[in-house]
């Protein structure tokens, strides 16, 4: 058993049918010695008396808010949560496996640049009695500071019969140098509590591996005289790290017909312009990627050919 | 992928071109190592990230873009003295800071070159003959060093008398390649920046 926060405790249980559970001793936070009784949650049934209460915690019915009283007055509370260990592996009931980029990915994180700011998000089908708390650091043995905000509900989607809820959090490394070569990964730890169930999820990454630039901005077409060709031009996204000559991007320009089946013409360039043939009803899209470290491509920025 | 490159300053161009070749070569070598050594811990998540140049060179600091010198987190000032007669820069552009930066890059390349050559000698003794260093990568390191043209003492190739532990050698190869790829990215960024300024 360990303390999650003041008066909230997590009991770790080896979870299998007929498991013996864990013996837990609760102590009433009071100078009083006599006339103390204990109850669980809203029940008025007295579970025991005395300054300490010994209980055998086996399943969720044994978890909850234990309260010690004296003469009708509440003295203190202890909330017991359960953390299930199923065959040597901590349970992951609360969050959905996003399966990207690989199985057992519960937390996904992205950064728009090298400033040390990043966003993480996760999915759940649970809509109520759910709380999250996020901590982060650079490295784990001698951790350096990363400050995270509060997790917020960022999207709701309907998936088949189920509603899916997306939560996200923004974090910022306290003293980040965009040009630094990372040797210690960022660690992100999310505590999730659903009713009386506690779970924790972690992700470890280097900022360089989670970079996904914003799409190029100011995408424009300039028709070339007496030609079906157009000059496409764009600019680096505002959110990208500067100077751009150091943090260079490479670009992919795509001409896509109306039908998805039509052949796509693609050109790769390091410049912020390209000359392409504009077909009727086609659209021109441009996306960006770090020129030197191949992390994710940005989403496409698009303009119609007409 | 073949990407068109903007026409560079003629004085800077050789280094920019060679640094791009270097990044391509080390990335290919790392990919090959990860595939060949699939049963070894060779992915970024599994290895310890060690920098063999730590406390010996200070490339990131010495090559910091002017725009980032205002960022206090970037000024991890390590005093290191370097030889200052680089030939990559047209003389009108040579400044103390640039020379310091290029000299630091040269020292990095020299240290990695020695490590890789020592390691290759060990890998050639492996009866499994599982993996060797790409000669192209070693050649590209050499070409960039020549383009930088710094005079410095030759570092003797380390020779080891004890029987090599091939498992450890292959894991060290992965560690070295990951670190060298990251340094090659920095070198490419620096060359691109210097070329543009």
């Amino acid at each position: 058993i360990w303390e999650l926060k003041k008066d909230v405790y997590v009991v770790e249980l080896d979870w299998y049918p007929d498991a013996p559970g864990e013996m837990v001793v609760l102590t009433c936070d009071t100078p009083e010695e006599d006339g103390i009784t204990w109850t669980l949650d809203q029940s008025s049934e007295v579970l025991g008396s005395g300054k300490t209460l010994t209980i055998q915690v086996k399943e969720f019915g044994d978890a909850g808010q234990y309260t010690c009283h004296k003469g009708g007055e509440v003295l203190s509370h202890s909330l017991l949560l359960l953390h299930k260990k199923e065959d040597g592996i901590w349970s992951t009931d609360i969050l959905k496996d996003q399966k990207e980029p690989k199985n057992k990915t519960f937390l996904r994180c992205e950064a728009k640049n090298y400033s040390g700011r990043f966003t993480c998000w996760w999915l759940t089908t649970i809509s109520t009695d759910l709380t999250f708390s996020v901590k982060s650091s650079r490295g784990s043995s001698d951790p350096q500071g990363v400050t995270c905000g509060a997790a917020t509900l960022s999207a709701e989607r309907v998936r088949g019969d189920n509603k899916e809820y997306e939560y996200s959090v923004e974090c910022q490394e306290d003293s980040a140098c965009p040009a630094a070569e990372e040797s210690l990964p960022i660690e992100v730890m999310v505590d999730a509590v659903h009713k009386l169930k506690y779970e924790n999820y972690t992700s470890s990454f280097f900022i360089r591996d989670i970079i996904k630039p914003d799409p190029p901005k100011n995408l424009q077409l300039k028709p070339l005289k007496n030609s079906r060709q157009v000059e496409v031009s764009w600019e680096y996204p505002d959110t990208w790290s500067t100077p751009h000559s150091y943090f260079s991007l490479t670009f992919c320009v795509q001409v896509q017909g109306k039908s998805k089946r039509e052949k796509k013409d693609r050109v790769f360039t390091d410049k912020t312009s390209a000359t392409v043939i504009c077909r009727k009803n086609a659209s021109i899209s441009v996306r960006a990627q770090d020129r030197y470290y191949s992390s994710s491509w940005s989403e496409w920025a698009s303009v119609p050919c007409s | 992928r073949n990407l068109p490159v903007a026409t560079p300053d003629p004085g800077m161009f050789p280094c920019l071109h060679h640094s791009q070749n270097l990044l391509r070569a080390v990335s290919n070598m790392l990919q090959k190592a990860r595939q060949t050594l699939e049963f070894y811990p060779c992915t970024s998540e599994e290895i310890d990230h060690e920098d063999i140049t730590k406390d010996k060179t200070s490339t990131v600091e010495a090559c910091l873009p002017l725009e980032l010198t205002k960022n206090e987190s970037c000024l991890n000032s390590r005093e290191t003295s370097f030889i200052t007669n680089g030939s990559c820069l047209a003389s009108r552009k040579t400044s103390f800071m640039m020379a310091l930066c290029l000299s630091s890059i040269y020292e990095d390349l020299k240290m990695y070159q020695v490590e890789f050559k020592t390691m290759n000698a060990k890998l050639l003794m492996d009866p499994k003959r599982q993996i060797f260093l790409d000669q192209n990568m070693l050649a590209v390191i050499d070409e960039l060093m020549q383009a930088l043209n710094f005079n410095s003492e030759t570092v003797p190739q380390k020779s080891s008398l004890e029987e090599p532990d091939f498992y450890k050698t292959k894991i060290k190869l992965c560690i070295l390649l990951h670190a060298f790829r990251i340094r090659a990215v920095t070198i490419d960024r620096v060359m691109s920046y210097l070329n543009a300024s």
Epitope: Y16, P17, D87, G88, K104 | F39, E46
Partner: antibody, heavy 115, light 112 residues
């Protein structure tokens, strides 16, 4: 004590269907994940499928994906395996099993797929 | 498509020490715990070892398990006639959990 009693096995022709049941007693069935495991005659153990305690997630071996469906009825304390498009290679003893460090197995039920 | 490899058979005379190996990889035994089962002919498997080296109550102490890196082993010290059975190791793969990964199985024969 914990008990898992299996039923539903038998002889079936290729391409036909069969449903296996596993009745649980002696524990809070709705709190635990459950597996199906099979063993072809003279062969080793092969995992077939898993279902979470609340039925929210199901996982299958590639060899049965799209043909077998694992389900549970927590009000009846029963686990099921619906098997469709059966093949000769599905011939095996099928076991249900609880998930956890200490597990309990059903007695097994024989499924024979033969024309 | 077994990922955990066991020797097909091992044998020993009563009182001898018999060991069975179970070889896996970094993503299974390397990161997860190992169980061992005993299966007597015509019966369901019986748990012998969980958590690499833990014995459930009721399992004789002549059975012991261990794990090192990407391999595990089961030792029977002082093997007895009633130990003649098939033995399976089991673990999980970090990418496919909760799918159970079973070893190929080992037939233990007690001679004499």
């Amino acid at each position: 004590q914990v008990q898992l009693v299996q039923s539903g096995g038998g002889v079936v022709q290729p391409g036909r269907s069969l449903r296996l049941s596993c009745a649980a007693s002696g524990f809070t069935f709705s709190s635990y994940g459950m597996h199906w495991v099979r063993q072809a005659p003279g062969k080793g153990l092969e995992w077939v499928a898993f279902i979470r305690y609340d039925g929210s997630n199901k996982y299958y071996a590639d060899s049965v994906k799209g043909r077998f469906t694992i389900s549970r009825d927590n009000s009846k304390n029963t686990l099921y395996l619906q098997m469709k498009s059966l093949r000769a290679e599905d011939t095996a003893v099928y076991y249900c099993k609880t998930h956890g460090s200490h597990d309990n197995w059903g007695q097994g039920t024989m499924v024979t797929v033969s024309s | 498509s077994y990922v955990l490899t066991q020797p097909p058979s091992v044998s020993g005379t009563p009182g001898q020490r018999v060991t069975i190996s179970c070889s896996g990889g970094r993503s299974n035994i390397g990161t997860n715990t190992v169980k061992w089962y005993q299966q007597l002919p015509g019966t369901a498997p019986k748990l012998l070892i969980y958590g690499n080296d833990q014995r459930p109550s009721g399992v004789p102490d002549r059975f012991s398990g261990s794990k090192s890196g990407t391999s595990a082993s089961l030792a029977i010290t002082g093997v007895q006639a009633e130990d003649e059975a098939d033995y399976y190791c089991q673990s999980y793969d970090r990418g496919t959990h909760p799918a159970l990964l079973f070893g190929t199985g080992t037939k233990v024969t007690v001679l004499g």
